[in-house]
Interface confidence: medium
Amino acid sequence: KPHPAEGQWRAVDVVLDCFLAKDGAHRGALASSEDRARASLVLKQVPVLDDGSLEDFTDFQGGTLAQDDPPIIFEASVDLVQIPQAEALLHADCSGKEVTCEISRYFLQMTETTVKTAAWFMANMQVSGGGPSISLVMKTPRVTKNEALWHPTLNLPLSPQGTVRTAVEFQVMTQTQSLSFLLGSSASLDCGFSMAPGLDLISVEWRLQHKGRGQLVYSWTAGQGQAVRKGATLEPAQLGMARDASLTLPGLTIQDEGTYICQITTSLYRAQQIIQLNIQASPKVRLSLANEALLPTLICDIAGYYPLDVVVTWTREELGGSPAQVSGASFSSLRQSVAGTYSISSSLTAEPGSAGATYTCQVTHISLEEPLGASTQVVPPERRT
């Protein structure tokens, strides 16, 4: 394990509230409560970095859940793999985030003999707010029915504490489920994995899905990488050493926006992570006067922005006064450039008043940390030369 400059590594039990998808149930976002059972997942003795907040942390005690409808408890040992984002799962509550967790049966495309000797489950965990997402494949040994405790619906043996004991043999994770990058910049889409000794890495595949179309972006198999999207790179050395399958996309265009799927296939298992990549382009603003007539018209040109949503506000400030919002602006038709960015113009009839006034066109857009504005002074006709 790595040695951090500060803090100590400590092994803790990470307990998560989950749902177990019932066998044969339709798995998806709209699964009904009848299709899912309550479950708990206990990741046993996960090494996490203790920043001092784990002092009163106690390990999971089995059999303490006295409820009418007790959840199925999965105990998963992580001795065979690494869970690098365990801290995020552990501290989610404290940082005001939620962890969603769904467990489902995982079926191997293996011979009947192998399948009869063990059962597999997949656990998908996601930290809200764009945090990490982890997919685990857990294996439970299947033993004979003369065990004292047996789960009737799972058809699996239970430990003396009434839990289903499993070992995590494979995990695929991303640190960020959603990313935003500026048009033209370079993006790195994070995808890491860890597998039990004895498993071999077979392939890595990155796919992009956007507006109903799907396409291969990059594939690595049998030691050979192939970029379908020009410039896409994945560092083969990192695959073997760091178990890092992150994808780098240089020179982002609007066509790169969408849902990326990182799929890792080993000799036994396959799992994936989904990452949403959003492209942004910041607007540019120009403010000018249409004419120098009695009531001049101000034109605010806004160009080169993406995505579409933009808010334009006008304010007027007389000398010595405070800015006041002005209504009555009109908009030109929206234009889209070859690159996919948008442009629009907003116009406003200016009323300079007796002493003149400063007009500001302010643009608010998701790509901007703060609104972008352009101001210009409009003087009364008698003061113009």
């Epitope: 120009r286 000018s288 249409a290 034109i299 080169g304 972008l372 101001s375």
Partner: antibody
Amino acid sequence: DVQLQESGPGLVKPSQTLSLTCSVTGYSLTSGYFWHWIRQFPGNKLEWMGYISYSGTTNYNPSLKNRISITHDSSKNQFFLNLNSVTAEDTATYFCAGDDWDWFAYWGQGTLVTVSA
Amino acid sequence: ENVLTQSPAIMSASPGEKVTMTCSASSSVNYMHWYQQKSSTSPKLWIYDTSKLASGVPGRFSGSGSGNSYSLTISSMEAEDVATYYCFQGSGYPLTFGSGTKLEIK
């Protein structure tokens, strides 16, 4: 390729009007760019004077607002600078420039204007 | 108006040396742009939108910064980089230029 060329008198008397023309080739003035006048004083300080947009709208530097006028003639693909009531302080090299939202991507070669009696 | 202060005013560097010049704005701006001007020629757009290189600009040039503080860096000085570099802001009117950094070669 967009090209700009300044022309006009190299010597102007104080209190008179400085008039310069910028001829644009390779792009139509009304197609979507912004067309600026910028000057560089003898000490190399650069000053933005103002622009006229593709739609004919204008914006001027407040320090020149009462003296400056920028117009265009789309039929000749030219835009113009008029600066009245000039003084010796207006002695500078005057550049016309065009931009496609990426500020002054295209420049003329500049023309030196001396204000002197 | 937004005053842009460039430093140093004059600097010299040996071939291969890393060069960094800065531009400080009296008011925060969204982007900074840079122009290169060689003697007796018009300025050329060199870096726009803080960090994007204009067409034909060598990859040894880079731009960075945010808010009130921006910089232009040359990773390895070459003789052809001798020029005056001006920063420029287009976020607020009037549009303003910095006073320039004159880069010489040792």
